[in-house]
C-alpha cells in the first residue's frame, strides 16, 4: 500500500494514527470520527489543550493515546462524549495536573501518565489513591512529581473532600408548611456546590438561596409525598466531591384500607396503611382484640424505599369456620386514627361431616420446594367435602 500523506492515517478497520510531526493543533474534524475505536497521536507539539469539543462525535472510542506531544491541559469534561473509553495513554507530555473529574464516569482499565512534569498537590490526591489501590496500572509507572519526588510520598493529610452539614428543622413539619434547609460547606479550595432535588417532583415548591459556603433551600407548601424523598447537598473541590442526603419528615394522620380476603398458599386479608409517623396497628375480630399467633398474624410486604405507605396481609394459616367473621384494622399515630373493616368467610364448619363417608377429591402431587414457609405438600385428600387449592 502506498504511504499515507495525510496528518492522520487509517490503522486497521476502526483506528487512526496521527504521527506526522506538528501536523495537529486540535482534534476537530478527524476523518471517520464517529466509528473510531482507537486513536493514536504522537509528536504533536502544537496539541496543547484537550477539551470537550475536541472529542465530540467520538462516541465509540475505546483507546486514546496522545504521547510525546505538547499536551498541557485536559479539561475536566474532556471525555464526556467518550463514555466507552477504557485505555488512556497521555505519557510524555507537559501535564502538570489532571483533574479527578476528567476520569470520573469512565471505566478506565489503564491510565498512563509517566513522563509528565506532574506537580504534587491535593489535586493529584485521587491519582495517589489509584496508585495505593492498584488501579489502572498506575503503580507500575512509579510516577514522579517534578522536583518533588515520588507521587506516592506526597503528604496528603490536608487533602480532603469538602465537609457538609445539612441543617433540618427539629420541630414537626406539617402538610402545607414551609421548610428551610441550610447546607454548610467547609474545606479547602471549594469550587462548586448545589442541591440535587430530582426526587422531589410535586412534593413542594422549591426556592434556592445563598452560595458557598452556606446554601439555603426553601421547600414551600410541602405535601406528604415529601416523606422518604432525598434532598441532597453536594460540593466539589480539587480533591473530589462530597454529598449528604437528608429527608424531611412531614407529619400526617394515619389512614387504612382493607381488601377482600384472598387464598394463596395461605389466606391473606390484604391491607394498606399510611401515616407519618408510622401508625401502630391493631386487629379486631368480631369487635374483640385479635391476639396474633403463628396461625393468624400481620405480615408486611417489603416497603418501597421512597414512600410511607405499607402494604401487607393479615395471614391466616389453614383457617376454619371459627375464623369467619368481621375483621377490623385500627391504625393510629399522634395525628389521627383510622379503621377499616371487612367480612371474611373462609369455610363452613368442616368438622361436621362423617369421616367414614369422604367425598373423593383428587389432587396432583406437589414435589417442588416450598417457598411459602409452609410444609411442602405431597398430595391433598380432603375428607371434609371442601375443595381447596393446593399451592
Amino acid at each position: 500500500a502506498a504511504p499515507c500523506p495525510d496528518a492522520c492515517c487509517p490503522h486497521g478497520s476502526s483506528g487512526l494514527r496521527c504521527t506526522r510531526d506538528g501536523a495537529l493543533d486540535s482534534l476537530h474534524h478527524l476523518p471517520g470520527a464517529e466509528n473510531l475505536t482507537e486513536l493514536y497521536i504522537e509528536n504533536q507539539q502544537h496539541l496543547q489543550h484537550l477539551e470537550l469539543r475536541d472529542l465530540r462525535g467520538l462516541g465509540e472510542l475505546r483507546n486514546l493515546t496522545i504521547v510525546k506531544s505538547g499536551l498541557r491541559f485536559v479539561a475536566p469534561d474532556a471525555f464526556h462524549f467518550t463514555p466507552r473509553l477504557s485505555r488512556l495513554n497521555l505519557s510524555f507530555n507537559a501535564l502538570e495536573s489532571l483533574s479527578w473529574k476528567t476520569v470520573q464516569g469512565l471505566s478506565l482499565q489503564e491510565l498512563v501518565l509517566s513522563g509528565n512534569p506532574l506537580h504534587c498537590s491535593c489535586a493529584l490526591r485521587w491519582l495517589q489513591r489509584w496508585e495505593e489501590e492498584g488501579l489502572g496500572g498506575v503503580p507500575e509507572q512509579k510516577l514522579q512529581c517534578h522536583g518533588q519526588g515520588p507521587l506516592a510520598h506526597m503528604p496528603n493529610a490536608s487533602c480532603g473532600v469538602p465537609t457538609l452539614k445539612v441543617q433540618v428543622p427539629n420541630a414537626s413539619v406539617d402538610v402545607g408548611d414551609d421548610v428551610l434547609l441550610r447546607c454548610q460547606v467547609e474545606g479547602r479550595g471549594l469550587e462548586q456546590a448545589g442541591w440535587i432535588l430530582t426526587e422531589l417532583e410535586q412534593s413542594a415548591t422549591v426556592m434556592k438561596s445563598g452560595g458557598l459556603p452556606s446554601l439555603g433551600l426553601t421547600l414551600a407548601n410541602v405535601t406528604s409525598d415529601l416523606n422518604r424523598k432525598n434532598v441532597t447537598c453536594w460540593a466539589e473541590n480539587d480533591v473530589g466531591r462530597a454529598e449528604v442526603s437528608v429527608q424531611v419528615n412531614v407529619s400526617f394522620p394515619a389512614s387504612v384500607q382493607l381488601h377482600t380476603a384472598v387464598e394463596m398458599h395461605h389466606w391473606c386479608i390484604p391491607f394498606s396503611v399510611d401515616g407519618q409517623p408510622a401508625p401502630s396497628l391493631r386487629w379486631l375480630f368480631n369487635g374483640s382484640v385479635l391476639n396474633e399467633t403463628s396461625f393468624i398474624f400481620t405480615e408486611f410486604l417489603e416497603p418501597a424505599a421512597n414512600e410511607t405507605v405499607r402494604h401487607g396481609c393479615l395471614r391466616l394459616n389453614q383457617p376454619t369456620h371459627v375464623n369467619n367473621g368481621n375483621y377490623t384494622l385500627l391504625a393510629a399515630n399522634p395525628f389521627g386514627q383510622a379503621s377499616a373493616s371487612i367480612m371474611a368467610a373462609f369455610m363452613d364448619n368442616p368438622f361436621e361431616f362423617n369421616p367414614e363417608d369422604p367425598i373423593p377429591v383428587s389432587f396432583s402431587p406437589v414435589d417442588t420446594n416450598s417457598t411459602s414457609g409452609d410444609p411442602v405438600e405431597k398430595k391433598d385428600e380432603t375428607p371434609f367435602g371442601v375443595s381447596v387449592a393446593v399451592g
Epitope: S294, F297, T382, F384
Partner: antibody, heavy 115, light 108 residues
Amino acid sequence: EVQLQESGPGLVKPSGTLSLTCAVSGGSISSSNWWTWVRQPPGKGLEWIGEIYHRGNRNYNPSLKSRVTISVDKSKNQFSLKLSSVTAADTAVYYCARAPWFDYWGQGTLVTVSS
Amino acid sequence: SSELTQDPAVSVALGQTVRITCQGASLRSYYASWYQQKPGQAPVLVIYGKNKRPSGIPDRFSGSSSGNTASLTITGAQAEDEADYYCASQASSGNHLIFGGGTKLTVL
C-alpha cells in the same frame, strides 16, 4: 432446607435459669414464619412452651408464662429460651421448631435440673 | 378444657389399617396436626391442616375429623411405622398450642 440447632448448658441448678439458643440455617429467621420451643420430659409426652415472630410478637403456654421468656436475634439468625426458677420437673429434652406446623425441628438437647 | 386425649397404646397387624384418635373440645374449631416420633429422635410432621401431608410422607397416612375427634389413619401399616404418635392443635382460645398425651403404635 431449613435446619435448626439447639445449644446451651446440659445441667442447671434448681432455682436457676435455663437458657437455650436455637440457630436457624438454610433460611431467614425474618421470613414469614414463627419459631417455637417444645419440651419432652424423659419418658413423657410433648409440651408446647411458646412461640415468637421476628417482629417481636410472642405467645406462651399459660402454665409456664410467669417463668418463660423467648427472644429473637435477627442479626445472628437465632432465637432463645429462658426459663427461670427451674425445678427437677423442668428436666426434659428441649426442642426448637418452626411454627405453626412444626415441620422442621432441631435434634433436641437434654437439660437436667439437679444440684 | 385445654386438653387433647389419646389412647396410650394401639397395635396393628402388618399391612392392616389402623386409626389413632385424638379427642378434645378445641378440635371442633381447629385442625389437628400429627407427629411421629421414634425413640431418641425428634418428632416428624406427618399430617397438618386440612389433611395435608408434607413432602416425603407416604400416602398411607391420612387425617380426618368429626365433631371433637381427629383421627390419623395408616392404611397398610408397615414395620417402620412403629412409633409414638402425637396430635396437636390450637387451644380453644386460639392463643396457644396443646399436644395430646401420645399413642404408642406397635406393628405386629
